[in-house]
Interface confidence: medium
């Protein structure tokens, strides 16, 4: 159905985006966009004088706040005001609707049902995503911020969808993929967060994603120069071949009895206790 602007809305200077509305183009004002905006600030012939400007400040008028409902336009009369009602409304304040479901008043696929009382000739039952007496207003469902943890919201129409930030998942981005809570690492392993997925830092002798796999510490052949590796409850032990020494048999033993250990730090002689 074509949009019905507020009755009397100036076709030259006004426009509407919703039923019963009258929005003014630049340079025009008033409820019907018929009053040109003046550069002068002293237009009003009525009301008390302002001490600061000397201009007449408008007092409250009968049309202030627009007492006319349903898009009616107000005009002042010598005694009070008068409402010019849009098609389908009547009454002192345009509060009575003469529109029926036959007029197709519900927008955006709204379902029209005849009103139960005389003051309401019809009621629009709006589809999801729309509201207003004529289902004319789109509900910004994403403004309710349904996506958690910084997710971006998309209103498809039939449903809301959330585009999650890295490290989060689920319909509302409610699942923290980095979260170690409730994710047990077996055999004394500790959970480490980061990188978009939790991981386990395993105790010696264990490996795998959850530290459930028994690891052979000797599998990587850690003992140098032909040393033999023995798995131990606390890790591994290297039995060095003749002529080598060190935790991994990495240091050769010289014939004169000295070893090729790393040089002592400056200020220390070999054999000195390290304070």
């Amino acid at each position: 159905a074509p949009l019905v602007c507020r009755a009397g809305c100036s076709p030259e200077h006004g426009f509407c985006e919703q039923p019963g509305e009258c929005r003014c183009l630049e340079g025009w004002t008033g409820p019907l966009c018929t009053v040109p905006v003046s550069t002068s600030s002293c237009l009003s012939p009525r009301g008390p004088s302002s001490a600061t400007t000397g201009c007449l400040v408008p007092g409250p008028g009968p049309c202030d706040g627009n007492p006319c409902a349903n898009g009616g336009s107000c005009s002042e009369t010598p005694r009070s005001f008068e409402c010019t009602c849009p098609r389908g409304f009547y009454g002192l304040r345009c509060e009575v609707s003469g529109v029926t479901c036959a007029d197709g008043p519900c927008f955006n696929g709204g379902l029209c049902v005849g009103g139960a009382d005389p003051d309401s000739a019809y009621i629009c039952h709006c589809p999801p995503g729309f509201q207003g007496s004529n289902c004319e207003k789109r509900v910004d469902r994403c403004s309710l911020q349904p996506c958690r943890n910084g997710g971006l919201c998309l209103d498809l129409g039939h449903a809301l969808r959330c585009r999650c930030r890295a490290g989060f998942a689920g319909p509302r981005c409610e699942h923290d993929l980095d979260d170690c809570a409730g994710r047990a690492c077996a055999n004394g392993g500790t959970c480490v967060e980061g990188g978009g997925a939790h991981r386990c830092s395993c105790a010696l002798g264990f490996g795998g994603r959850d530290c459930r796999e028994r690891a052979d510490p000797c599998a990587a052949r850690p003992c140098a120069h032909g040393g033999r590796c023995y798995a131990h409850f606390s890790g591994l032990v290297c039995a060095c071949a003749p002529g080598y020494m060190g935790a991994r048999c990495e240091f050769p033993v010289h014939p004169d009895g000295a070893s090729a250990l790393p040089a002592a730090p400056p200020g220390l002689r070999p054999g000195d206790p390290q304070r």
């Epitope: 696929g109 999801p128 995503g129 998309l154 449903a159 999650c164």
Partner: antibody, heavy 123, light 112 residues
Framework: QSVEESGGRLVTPGTPLTLTCTVS????????MSWVRQAPGKGLEWIGI?????DPYYASWAKGRFTISKTSTTMDLKITSPTTEDTATYFC????????????????????WGPGTLVTVSS | ALVMTQTPSSVSAAVGGTVTINCQAS??????LAWYQQKPGQRPKLLIY???NLESGVPSRFKGSGSGTEYTLTISDLECDDAAIYYC??????????????FGGGTEVVVK
């Protein structure tokens, strides 16, 4: 509830072409709609969607090459500057799905589909 | 980018037999997977949504399963009418900005 495409024809490269998807039995303001194409003898290729509110989203390869828009009863796909690689059958389809998830899962799918309209780009 | 890899590209089985089509997503799509059937010259038809939910009117011979990144479509008691190309599609609105709803490459089912 049905959808149907129209506007497919033979065009020369560079000549803009607009395809139209007409729906009946449901409101375009309540459903997202999608365009999918299929080159002769090839698979299905997703082009983009337009949400119930009128916001279009495109596949990265389709940005700038296609424009999706809609009215109250039709959805359009404009091929801005067709090339021979755009020769295909173009389908429109409605997106259906659950409003809210019961657990950690929800679903979306395309149904119904139109019969398709053939676009041939040749000099 | 989210990529859907379908295997095999073609499979053949006798009437009454069973075929299995696999679909692998390059990231977790949380069971948001749809399967479609397309016969030559026709529009695609929705078979399964949410990885395992059968669309109304589709025979129970079609069964979808899987989770995470691995999904399967199984067609049992094959009929001649099942000869078609089958496509999987991710329906998960993901962090991928390249393609929101990508399809797999398709699997041709030949019924002997």
């Amino acid at each position: 509830q049905s959808v149907e495409e129209s506007g497919g024809r033979l065009v020369t490269p560079g000549t803009p072409l607009t395809l139209t998807c007409t729906v009946s039995g449901f409101s375009l303001s309540r459903y997202a709609m999608s365009w999918v194409r299929q080159a002769p003898g090839k698979g299905l290729e997703w082009i983009g969607i337009i949400t119930g509110g009128g916001d279009p989203y495109y596949a990265s390869w389709a940005k700038g090459r296609f424009t999706i828009s809609k009215t109250s009863t039709t959805m359009d796909l404009k091929i801005t500057s067709p090339t021979t690689e755009d020769t295909a059958t173009y389908f429109c389809a409605r997106m259906i799905g659950s409003e809210y998830a019961s657990s950690s899962e929800y679903y979306d799918a395309f149904d119904p589909w139109g019969p398709g309209t053939l676009v041939t780009v040749s000099s | 980018a989210l990529v859907m890899t379908q295997t095999p590209s073609s499979v053949s089985a006798a009437v009454g037999g069973t075929v299995t089509i696999n679909c692998q997503a390059s990231q977790n799509i949380y069971s948001n997977l749809a399967w479609y059937q397309q016969k030559p010259g026709q529009r695609p038809k929705l078979l399964i949504y949410g990885a395992s939910n059968l669309e109304s009117g589709v025979p129970s011979r079609f069964k979808g399963s899987g989770s995470g990144t691995e999904y399967t479509l199984t067609i049992s008691d094959l009929e001649c009418d099942d000869a078609a190309i089958y496509y999987c599609q991710s329906a998960y609105y993901t962090t991928s900005v390249d393609v929101l709803y990508p399809f797999g490459g398709g699997t041709e089912v030949v019924v002997k």
